[in-house]
Interface confidence: low
């Protein structure tokens, strides 16, 4: 899920929801595991650059070595730069840590483009702006990499928060979050609020930092508005979910719902874009093009290769439609929808210094490995990874970017039948989990 590789002039939503609207449940939300309310010490503990990922400060070793670590819900290894590299300002120096233990085992992780490889060990790890604990965790010390680290991104490693099934070299390597939960009394839940830059970058210093929060062990109610809606985690490998319907400005794409989840749908903070299977992508682009036809854009824009620019402050948000994904709900035959705005899926281009224009990339792209709900989706929402109850929660983020006419939304419930049929069953072969990289 490495970012460099894989890492409004209408009020409300367009059109009434299709399908029967069920009455709202009376209790706002069922009891959450873990601590509730305020996690003040963890709020705003993420930083990053738009399109280059969100990172948290961590310390490794004794005495502690401070590193910035990319938060990646699409992989399961804790891996850090451990040798000099032109794009790294600092790296983990195992020889300086009195608590480092060598596992005498190598690890090699190829991506569709690029790779990293390293040596496995364990050491003491803590998160300064996280829970006040230190745990012994597996660490992959990256000794060699290609197209993995990003020049100027300011992170030196990756924290894979998904499940052991996709850990490298195999599922016997316990992921960091599993170690954290096992060794402490921290509940098996974390939540992410990713706050996109939200402005054309020339209104501040270009390449401005974005921020956010990773709440470990619970939910912070100050980070979202409205209620949390939960979708089941289909299988504990990636954070796999099931999409049951897709709408562009309220118009159903009317595809067999299996297509939306071919070959899986995952929530991945380490991917920038909303990535869609080929057929779904083509249908979605066709629909978005039609909705925004008052302006013409080059084909390269829809392929994510070219920018579109407008004079500063004149971006015509209103011509672009909202995108709604309906997710399987916790109750039989019930779904809910999450809706993002063009402010989420048109990404201000970070590496452009100009005072004349606001430029954007289309951050919806084609995938050959299923749907990836990357930062483009997550920046609209507070996302709760409730591992204890095998579910993922979505609520409107208190920091999402919107305008005076439209806002991101999480709404439900909707009646949707036969949702189980929407999941794709991957043929069980030795190859099925080989490609962790998302191109």
């Amino acid at each position: 899920t490495h970012l460099g590789i894989r890492l409004p002039l209408r009020s409300g939503l367009a059109g009434p929801p299709l399908g029967l609207r069920l009455p709202r449940e009376t209790d706002e939300e069922s009891e959450e595991p873990g601590r509730r309310g305020s996690f003040v010490e963890m709020v705003d503990n993420l930083r990053g650059k738009s399109g280059q990922g969100y990172y948290v400060e961590m310390t490794v070793g004794s005495p502690p070595q401070t590193l910035n670590i990319l938060v990646d819900t699409g992989s399961s290894n804790f891996a850090v730069g451990a040798a000099p590299h032109p794009f790294l300002h600092r790296y983990y120096q195992r020889q300086l840590s009195s608590t480092y233990r060598d596992l005498r085992k190598g690890v090699y992780v190829p991506y569709t483009q690029g790779k990293w490889e390293g040596e496995l060990g364990t050491d003491l790890v803590s998160i300064p702006h996280g829970p006040n604990v230190t745990v012994r965790a597996n660490i992959a010390a990256i000794t060699e990499s290609d197209k993995f680290f990003i020049n100027g991104s300011n992170w030196e490693g990756i924290l894979g928060l998904a499940y052991a099934e996709i850990a490298r070299p195999d599922d016997s390597l316990e992921p960091f979050f599993d170690s954290l939960v096992k060794q402490t009394h921290i509940p098996n839940i974390f939540s992410l609020q990713l706050c996109g830059a939200g402005f054309p970058l020339n209104q501040t210093e270009a390449l401005a930092s974005v921020g956010g929060s990773m709440i470990i062990g619970g939910i912070d109610h100050s980070l979202y508005t409205g209620r949390l809606w939960y979708t089941p985690i289909r299988r504990e490998w990636y954070y796999e979910v099931i999409i049951v319907r897709v709408e562009i400005n309220g118009q159903d794409l009317k595809m067999d719902c299996k297509e939306y989840n071919y070959d899986k749908s995952i929530v991945d903070s380490g991917t920038t874009n909303l990535r869609l299977p080929k057929k779904v992508f083509e249908a979605a682009v066709k629909s978005i093009k039609a909705a925004s036809s008052t302006e013409k854009f080059p084909d390269g824009f829809w392929l994510g290769e070219q920018l579109v620019c407008w004079q500063a402050g004149t971006t015509p948000w209103n011509i672009f439609p909202v995108i709604s994904l309906y997710l399987m709900g916790e109750v039989t035959n019930q779904s809910f929808r999450i809706t993002i705005l063009p402010q989420q899926y048109l990404r201000p281009v970070e590496d452009v210094a100009t005072s004349q224009d606001d430029c954007y990339k289309f951050a919806v792209s084609q995938s050959s490995t299923g749907t990836v709900m990357g930062a483009v989706i997550m920046e609209g929402f507070y996302v709760v990874f409730d591992r204890a109850r095998k579910r993922i929660g979505f609520a409107v983020s208190a920091c999402h970017v919107h305008d005076e006419f439209r806002t991101a939304a999480v709404e439900g419930p909707f009646v949707t039948a036969d949702m189980e049929d929407c999941g794709y069953n991957i043929p069980q072969t030795d190859e099925s989990t080989l490609m962790t990289g998302r191109a």
Epitope: A206, G300, L307, D351, A353, T354, D357, C359
Partner: antibody
Framework: QVQLVQSGAEVKKPGASVKVSCKAS????????MHWVRQAPGQGLEWMGS????????NYAQKFQGRVTMTRDTSISTAYMELSRLRSDDTAVYYC????????????WGQGTTVTVSS | DIQMTQSPSSLSASVGDRVTITCRAS??????LNWYQQKPGKAPKLLIY???SLQSGVPSRFSGSGSGTDFTLTISSLQPEDFATYYC?????????FGGGTKVEIK
Amino acid sequence: QVQLVQSGAEVKKPGASVKVSCKASGYTFTGYYMHWVRQAPGQGLEWMGSINPNSGGTNYAQKFQGRVTMTRDTSISTAYMELSRLRSDDTAVYYCARVRVRHYGMDVWGQGTTVTVSS
Amino acid sequence: DIQMTQSPSSLSASVGDRVTITCRASQSISSYLNWYQQKPGKAPKLLIYAASSLQSGVPSRFSGSGSGTDFTLTISSLQPEDFATYYCQQPLSHPRTFGGGTKVEIK
């Protein structure tokens, strides 16, 4: 008026390094990318790379990777291009040019700096 | 890398002639193409950006057309000051590549 003024001609020996400066005036230096282009005697234009004066982020042509370093000093609105391990075929006129993001056209160019590499 | 091929590499023409220079990209670059004019001993000058947009201050006898892979620079009525070398350039992807140039000489 908007202009880019480059440093004077240089004569260098093979293996040495050269650092060319490009001073911007008449516009907001951090508002435009700066690109570097060179032209060997009697030859065409060759793109070397670019720098974002705002962030210092760079993008180099593969051919020059490892030999070229582009930097900037925003306090004096100046961009620099340093080329190391010079060879005789690096003899060329080196230009800086600013680029507008909307169309990526190099709309203002420096006057050029002649670098001669000879033993 | 995207290769840019210009033709002809040189041409002879008279004042008042209509001159056409073509540029072909090795892959589609939509309308992301710029044209430059360079006179001996001088820095290049931007004439046309985005395939067909005339840069401010450039005479209207210069025009550009094309999209995708094939592009044309046209000088509707050649003037004495137009004798120079012309380059196309793609600004779509790194590395930014230039065509080999077309030298327009006096017949």
